[in-house]
Interface confidence: low
Amino acid sequence: ASFFGENHLEVPVATALTDIDLQLQFSTSQPEALLLLAAGPADHLLLQLYSGRLQVRLVLGQEELRLQTPAETLLSDSIPHTVVLTVVEGWATLSVDGFLNASSAVPGAPLEVPYGLFVGGTGTLGLPYLRGTSRPLRGCLHAATLNGRSLLRPLTPDVHEGCAEEFSASDDVALGFSGPHSLAAFPAWGTQDEGTLEFTLTTQSRQAPLAFQAGGRRGDFIYVDIFEGHLRAVVEKGQGTVLLHNSVPVADGQPHEVSVHINAHRLEISVDQYPTHTSNRGVLSYLEPRGSLLLGGLDAEASRHLQEHRLGLTPEATNASLLGCMEDLSVNGQRRGLREALLTRNMAAGCRLEEEEYEDDAYGHYEAFSTLAPEAWPAMELPEPCVPEPGLPPVFANFTQLLTISPLVVAEGGTAWLEWRHVQPTLDLMEAELRKSQVLFSVTRGARHGELELDIPGAQARKMFTLLDVVNRKARFIHDGSEDTSDQLVLEVSVTARVPMPSCLRRGQTYLLPIQVNPVNDPPHIIFPHGSLMVILEHTQKPLGPEVFQAYDPDSACEGLTFQVLGTSSGLPVERRDQPGEPATEFSCRELEAGSLVYVHRGGPAQDLTFRVSDGLQASPPATLKVVAIRPAIQIHRSTGLRLAQGSAMPILPANLSVETNAVGQDVSVLFRVTGALQFGELQKQGAGGVEGAEWWATQAFHQRDVEQGRVRYLSTDPQHHAYDTVENLALEVQVGQEILSNL
């Protein structure tokens, strides 16, 4: 069963539970999740994930029991985990994935839980002991039984059968808003220094919410929506409203790159790189975020917020949600996908527009023309063969269609005349007493990537022309330069003469005119998605990937592109990760995408990088990435003590020890070193990879990465008996690059 971050199931419990045999199998990527609550006025059993660890709380009368899984085993890894909790004959046992994790004696009293069982969340239950519990589950319960009875039946409409695809969707999978009340909630969008929200939007909705973030002060918010087919952004602060419109239409079913940028001075919305921004009036100031960032829809509170607002957003508009999809979502530069959402409603993994599906049905039989190679146009299905009425002139004997169609060939980005040979009559017009000016063409469906331009007064608006116009070269096709190698026009052809002829010619026949696009090689060019300045800490290395620079080439795949680093190769700071010390003067686009390259700073002023990229035929103009090396600044973020029993071991986690640096978008190596002797124990590090069972060995140096991975611990080895608590003072120094912070 799939739970989406705001749903739950309830199961009645009529009598007290004397024995408990609870079995759950769940998977989630969220570190917080309420799995199950058996609730009474005071007695209760709670199973939840907190910081990725399973916690069990059992309260029986005046007694409270807590069990939890070890810190080093995180269960929020999207993998199914099986939990078994048994309470039998005064003994509670918890095991996860077949391993015994904890057990303890419990009072023999039965568990009085008349409020019932709550699976996946607590609903509207408001009991004092629920304060501070985890968020509702966003993930899957593959199985849940209590004393042999399934807790997942019956399912409610909000809890779906099976395990939804969206929980395992990587962040390159689009967020599909399938309506009518779609919504995705993400962690709050902080805009303290500046905030950016970026995504690619595809929709035909002319009116729909896109993003809403409430502020800490009552009434403050940031709201981005589609209003009359265009993007609009509203920022409401205590000192007034900032309203911004963008002129690029977005409700056309085509993908549009959207970027919203806000800082203390201005607000900017950009669609397909066309920006609109407020003047630097400085009215915005900082909006302290409250609650979640809502995308594609609004919850009841946000709707209320907007309805109270003087913009006069109507209830209908605020209740509606986006119908369409968001791809490549990033919030403050961090990629976000369905997996990171805190809750979702009526969402789909991937982009499937209902309009598109409808179109596919309606034009299914045309589809072959747009996908087959141009030399192999199939026998025309269109027009439908015409059966002439009896008694017509002999010229119409065996007549089925008026025209023989041949593909129009155009260069990518070029123009081509529509000529007689493309729309050649199958019969002798003079013999049929028809004039070319009486054969009327009307464009019923335009090409996807170009325009038929008519050099005839008034014809462009009517999209109509005659065979005489074709002969006189009055109709030409102008291609828009896109990369598809085929396209098509749908033409309706009718005859306006008052002579005897088949009635189908008066009514009109529909023809498909295939368009074959001959590609032109576009030179690639280099783009810097986050600007052409890169900051690196002195004496460190920084990955060079597509987030730093990338190639744009509309007609070459990444496989066909090669980068060159220009300038002298000696001392070149670009290297492959697996060939350290070897300058990489040339590398492939694939290597760049795979994260194989690093910039290594070895001292002195940082060397700027000038690149060019080639598709094998043409090279881009050189592009320079300016690189600035800054001295590392190290700041202690956390340095708390540990309390542990003599003779035991305790992990040192980021909550106990972590530092922050001034690295910008750089995952730097932070080295801790022990500078003084330990009296009562030793610092230990787990073997590489932190694999289960890897040995712990004494160390006097470790990296912050080791701390983050739970691979550092303090082991008390002092065998002596003390009448007091002993205190080990761990003297550390921290090194980043060649910068050292001592006496930590």
Epitope: G676, G687, A688
Partner: antibody
């Protein structure tokens, strides 16, 4: 100035015993883990073993090739580390270095003795 | 045990050359690698630790990189005093092990 001064090397017959000493000055000996590393003539370096601090219960680790035959000990009052070598084999012929790590951490050796040659030959 | 394979075993170079020595571990050792320089008849001297951190007093022409299984020691511009044998060492797990060494000779 940190100094590790070694003594006790020499010629010994196979099956014999020898005790090497390493006297330390210039740092607080009792805070440093002491190690022994050896180098056969014209060959590479081989770690022999280590001894930790009193707070680590003087924990010892050894290379498989010497386990059961060699014993590392320390006397913090004399600032000296020892390598007791028993049941010596011809392949134990090497220059033996005592090394330490403490201040500049990681299990790599920041201070080295001058080395002492042990020759096992009949 | 973790084996460390150094290459090349011998290297002829001239003063001013850029020299690269590689060290390959038989399994993942993270960045727990140190490099030493040894001259004939002398004890080894530490150069780098944690794959890329220079030991106090080591000239900046010595640099190191790598993580996992592949490591490199680079001397950006060889000086007369750099002709020596270089060893890598892993301290990711016991037993601690060394590479076979790379002798840098004058061309």
């Amino acid at each position: 100035e940190v100094q590790l001064v070694q003594s006790g090397g020499g010629l010994v017959q196979p099956g014999g015993s020898l005790k090497l000493s390493c006297a330390v000055s210039g740092f607080t000996f009792s805070n440093y883990w002491m190690n022994w590393v050896r180098q056969a003539p014209g060959k590479g370096l081989e770690w022999v073993g280590e001894i930790r601090l009193k707070s680590n219960n003087f924990g010892r680790y050894y290379a498989e090739s010497v386990k059961g035959r060699f014993t590392i000990s320390r006397d913090d009052s004399k600032n000296t580390a020892y390598l007791q070598m028993n049941s010596l084999k011809t392949e134990d012929t090497a220059v033996y270095y005592c090394t330490s790590y403490g201040n500049y951490v990681g299990h790599y050796f920041d201070h080295w003795g001058q080395g002492t040659l042990v020759t096992v030959s009949s | 045990d973790i084996q460390l394979t150094q290459s090349p075993s011998f290297l002829s170079a001239s003063v001013g050359d850029r020299v690269t020595i590689t060290c390959k571990a038989s399994q993942n050792v993270d960045t727990n690698v140190a490099w030493y320089q040894q001259k004939p008849g002398k004890a080894p001297k530490p150069l780098l630790f944690s794959a890329s951190y220079r030991y106090t007093g080591v000239p900046s022409r010595f640099s190191g990189s790598g993580s996992g299984t592949d490591f490199t020691l680079t001397i950006s511009s060889l000086q007369p005093e750099d002709f020596a044998t270089y060893f890598c060492q892993q301290y990711n797990s016991y037993p601690l092990t060394f590479g076979g060494g790379t002798k840098v000779e004058i061309k």
